[in-house]
């Protein structure tokens, strides 16, 4: 797998999207996880609706949001208040039991907000010894999320 | 007039199956995701499982107690939603309901039931 | 799994009064909850759906409120059509009802 990049900036909203093929994930939940170091496990971070049917309602684990589309084949992610601690290597995944299969690796990069001008020595950036040569950068400026807001499927 | 009306319930021995069928009319049956409920005698209400609309090809969703003897189907040429009972025990009995999943006005829909038939009622007894 | 606490469990009110009946869930919930009312006898009847949405149809003295863990379903002033039981139900881990509240008139 590639590793797809996305930017947000500091204490704005950064929405990933991870397309997949709807029918071969078909019935399947999803998940987004936390890469531990290059090698080390995946650690969940939310997973979508128990019921697949119920994949698109959005589901919240503290700032982290995750709403699937099981009929276009989207997956969505949505940080919101993104800060410089979030920045890392994720996955995507579509769960099958006790397995996971990846459906997009991403990085997230967190940007120097422009108007704040305290010290942007603590935002992460992936430093040269990292090896992200297969990397493309999708730039994700995404809106806040009205409260309450909730994305569903059409059913037809 | 948009209605539900559920029928097949009876007396059946623990064991047995049994089959519910929940009949639509005044609404396009397809673009709707179907489920049922039961409540058990002086009880309360219980989910038991829901079907896709059209759109999901027929995929179920079940309550744990009922997962692998519920089978839950549609058939969309006359607008009836089935709920197929094996293996029924006496802690079944109850009055099943079928309902409608509710849709937005924008064509998407939610898990909250506004239309309901008037229950038909499963007794598993020996 | 998600229990749903309802309370009171029973309640007995004139016309006219303020009812208000609580739902707790025993973990976030986001808005993800719908309040029933059921007659005796009869099919239930969706009242409010995203824990604060009136559904078409149903009279303004019912109202919900509430997120997270804590909801509340209000009927401003009860009318003797009201008799019924009220049933909270969520939809954010699975599809589980409150164990009910029976509104009587004193």
């Known amino acids: 797998h590639n590793t797809t990049v996305f930017q947000g900036v500091a204490g704005q909203s950064l929405q990933v999207s991870c397309p997949y093929d709807s029918m071969k994930h078909w019935g399947r939940r999803k998940a987004w996880c936390r890469q531990l170091g290059e090698k080390g496990p995946c650690q969940r971070v939310v997973s979508t609706h128990n019921l697949w049917l119920l994949s698109f309602l959005r589901r919240w684990n503290g700032s982290t949001a995750i709403t699937d589309d099981t009929l276009g084949g989207t997956l969505t992610i949505t940080l919101r208040n993104l800060q410089p601690h979030d920045a890392g290597l994720y996955q995507c995944q579509s769960l099958h039991g006790s397995e996971a299969d990846t459906l997009r690796k991403v990085l997230v990069e967190v940007l120097a907000d422009p108007l704040d001008h305290r010290d942007a020595g603590d935002l992460w950036f992936p430093g040269e010894s990292e090896s992200f040569e297969d990397a493309h950068v999708e730039h994700s400026i995404s809106r806040s999320l009205l409260e309450g807001e909730i994305p569903f499927p059409p059913t037809s | 007039e948009v209605q539900l009306v559920e029928s097949g319930g009876g007396l059946v021995q623990p064991g047995r199956s049994l089959r519910l069928s929940c009949t639509a009319s005044?609404?396009?049956?397809?673009?709707?995701?179907m489920s049922w409920f039961r409540q058990a005698p002086g009880k309360g209400l219980e989910w038991v499982g829901f079907?896709?609309?059209?759109?999901?090809?027929?995929?179920?969703e079940y309550t744990a107690s009922v997962k692998g003897r519920f089978t839950i189907s549609r058939d969309g040429s006359k607008s009836i939603a089935y709920l197929q009972m094996n293996s029924l025990k006496t802690e079944d009995t109850a009055v099943y309901y079928c309902?409608?999943?509710?849709?937005?006005?924008?064509?998407?829909?939610?898990?909250?039931?506004?239309?309901w038939g008037q229950g038909t009622m499963v007794t598993v007894s020996s | 799994d998600i229990q749903m606490t309802q309370s009171p469990s029973s309640l007995s009110a004139s016309v006219g009064d303020r009812v208000t009946i609580t739902c707790q869930a025993s973990?976030?919930?986001?808005?993800?909850l719908n309040w029933y009312q059921q007659k005796p006898g009869k099919a239930p009847k969706l009242l409010i759906y995203?824990?604060?949405n009136l559904e078409t149809g149903v009279p303004s003295r019912f109202s919900g409120s509430g997120s997270g863990t804590d909801f509340t379903f209000t009927i401003s002033s009860l009318q003797p059509e009201d008799i019924a039981t009220y049933y909270c139900?969520?939809?954010?881990?699975?599809?589980?009802f409150g164990g009910g509240t029976k509104v009587e008139i004193k």
């Open positions: 973990q976030d919930i986001t808005n993800y």
């Open positions: 309902a409608r999943g509710k849709r937005r006005d924008y064509g998407y829909w939610h898990p909250a039931f506004d239309v």
């Open positions: 079907i896709g609309s059209k759109a999901y090809g027929g995929t179920t």
């Open positions: 139900q969520e939809y954010d881990q699975y599809l589980t």
């Open positions: 995203d824990a604060s």
């Open positions: 005044g609404f396009t049956f397809g673009d709707y995701a």
